[in-house]
Interface confidence: medium
């Protein structure tokens, strides 16, 4: 039997043991979570693999998603949304201690898909665990992409109240418009429900006291938001170490200055 | 010191139960997976069965599916595994582990083993 | 018969290399990370390689782990009197849905 033959993708391939992993995830998850505790983990399973399985993994689109947005659907409470952008670690440091806030990665659908890789091949069942495709060599409707695609524009679409962003300050674009949270995010936050966007610049240096709110990037940022008719607030954090320990710790004396 | 503790292991006849015990310490139990993994006398490493943390996944060799069952109760840091109707061929050293299956850390930390003989 | 298959011996002096292999399927050894572990006669398993290549803190560089398709490798360089005992390869099984373990490679340092 000759072996069939297979797209080579420059991307790396599906995640090891990828359906275990989805279904692990998702059971602890409505585990933890009481208000998720109704969701059937098999049949969001089902949904996930239903979006890619079988399809020629450079065109998928939102649309192949919905079923499984559907099932996951969940509300976060106004003023607790936490985005971010090139700097995923510190906000899920900061919203595991600050738990009443809530990044993507904290909701059912972003937890089950945080780190992992998938794709299938076209006409077969099969997951291809060889390669998938990349978003620059390959095309952007990859499943991935189009994946985080689709739940960042409806995790910003839901948001409301007062929106929080965590931006890295290290970067030199500290604001970029083709990151999800410049391309999807910011322009998915709903008006009528959103009052104001406030960015949190993460500063990288110890001894650097520069405001970074200042920076051009900045300004485009809040260009594009107060168009939008949302207002627009920008802080730094000079020390993020300091201010992870605030959050823990509110009452501690050094706290009373700036972070 | 991370430590797993089997106990529960002795002589029993063909068809006969037995209920193996692990208990844990030195780590927060309810954070990790946890397997069973058998040893028969002079052979190889033989996957049991691993249990999530909430209990809610559960997966079984064929050998031993429907007839044994690990459990788990977080509370008393302990993770079981009920025997039934067993046979010569289940007579092995046994070894409970802590196992990072989400992370992909593997097996990490072991137990001692306890012995199982079934024979009449 | 073990599903991955691991030759049942090999030896060698101290300070030599060595390596062994470990030869599997699609829906074991490629599709999945690899694991491997050292036992020592009359003691437990000792986790030694995870995610194919990955050292667990503790575990000496002499050990280093690698996979190419369907097979995969452990090396131990530098071999020490202490290294003799039975290596095991292990993974998850796709189409199984379980692990398995290779038999068992049993090393004799000479």
């Known amino acids: 039997v000759l072996p069939r033959w297979r797209q080579q993708w420059s991307g790396s391939g599906t995640t090891s043991r990828f359906p275990e992993t989805v279904l692990a995830r998702c059971v602890k998850y409505t585990e933890v979570h009481p208000e998720m505790r109704h969701v059937d983990c098999q049949s969001v399973w089902d949904a996930f693999k239903g979006a890619f399985i079988s399809k020629y993994p450079c065109n998928i689109t939102e649309e192949d998603y919905q079923p499984l947005v559907k099932l996951g659907t969940q509300t976060v409470p106004c003023n607790k949304t936490l985005l971010w952008s090139r700097i995923k670690d510190l906000a899920h440091q900061f919203t595991q201690v600050q738990r009443d806030m809530f990044t993507l990665e904290d909701m059912l659908l972003g937890y089950l898909a945080d780190d992992l890789t998938w794709c299938g091949e076209f006409n077969t069942f099969e997951i291809n665990y060889q390669s998938c495709p990349d978003w620059r060599k390959d095309c952007s409707n990859n499943p991935v992409s189009v994946f985080w695609k689709t739940v960042s524009r409806r995790f910003a679409e839901t948001a409301c109240g007062v929106v929080h962003v965590m931006l890295n300050g290290s970067r030199s674009k500290i604001f970029d418009k083709n990151s999800t949270f410049g391309s999807v995010e910011v322009h998915n936050l709903q008006p009528e429900k959103v009052q104001a966007l406030e960015a949190w610049v993460i500063h990288g240096g110890r001894e650097d006291s520069r405001d970074l709110c200042q920076d051009p990037t900045i300004k485009e940022l809040e260009s594009i938001i107060s168009k939008r008719n949302i207002r627009f607030f920008c802080k730094n954090i000079y020390r993020p170490d300091k201010f992870l320990q605030c959050v823990k710790n509110p009452e501690d004396s050094s706290c009373l200055s700036g972070i | 010191e991370v430590l797993l503790l089997e106990s529960g292991g002795g002589l029993v006849q063909p068809g006969g139960s037995l209920r193996l015990s692990c208990a844990a310490s030195?780590?927060?139990?309810?954070?990790?997976?946890m397997s069973w993994v058998r040893q028969a006398p002079g052979k190889g490493l033989e996957w049991v069965s691993t249990?999530?943390?909430?209990?809610?996944?559960?997966y079984y060799a064929d050998s031993v599916k429907g007839r044994f069952t690990i459990s788990r109760d977080n509370s008393k840091n302990t993770l079981y595994l009920q025997m039934n109707s067993l046979r010569a061929e289940d007579t092995a050293v046994y070894y409970c582990?802590?196992?990072?299956?989400?992370?992909?850390?593997?097996?990490?930390?072991w137990g001692q083993g306890t012995t199982v003989t079934v024979s009449s | 018969q073990s599903v991955l298959t691991q030759p049942p011996s090999a030896s060698g002096t101290p300070g030599q290399r060595v390596t062994m292999s470990c030869s599997g399927n699609?829906?074991?050894?490629?599709?999945?990370?690899v694991y491997w572990y050292q036992q020592v006669p009359g003691t437990a398993p000792k986790l030694l390689i995870y995610k194919d290549d990955q050292r667990p803190s503790g575990v000496p560089d002499r050990f280093s782990g690698s996979k190419s398709g369907t097979s995969a490798s452990l090396a131990i360089s530098g071999l020490q009197s202490e290294d003799e005992a039975d290596y095991y390869c292990a993974t998850w099984d796709g189409s199984l849905k379980a692990r398995v373990f290779g038999g068992g490679t049993k090393l004799t340092v000479l």
């Open positions: 582990a802590k196992d990072n299956w989400n992370d992909y850390y593997g097996m990490d930390v």
């Open positions: 030195g780590f927060t139990f309810s954070d990790y997976w």
């Open positions: 249990i999530s943390i909430s209990a809610g996944i559960i």
């Open positions: 699609n829906q074991n050894i490629r599709d999945n990370y």
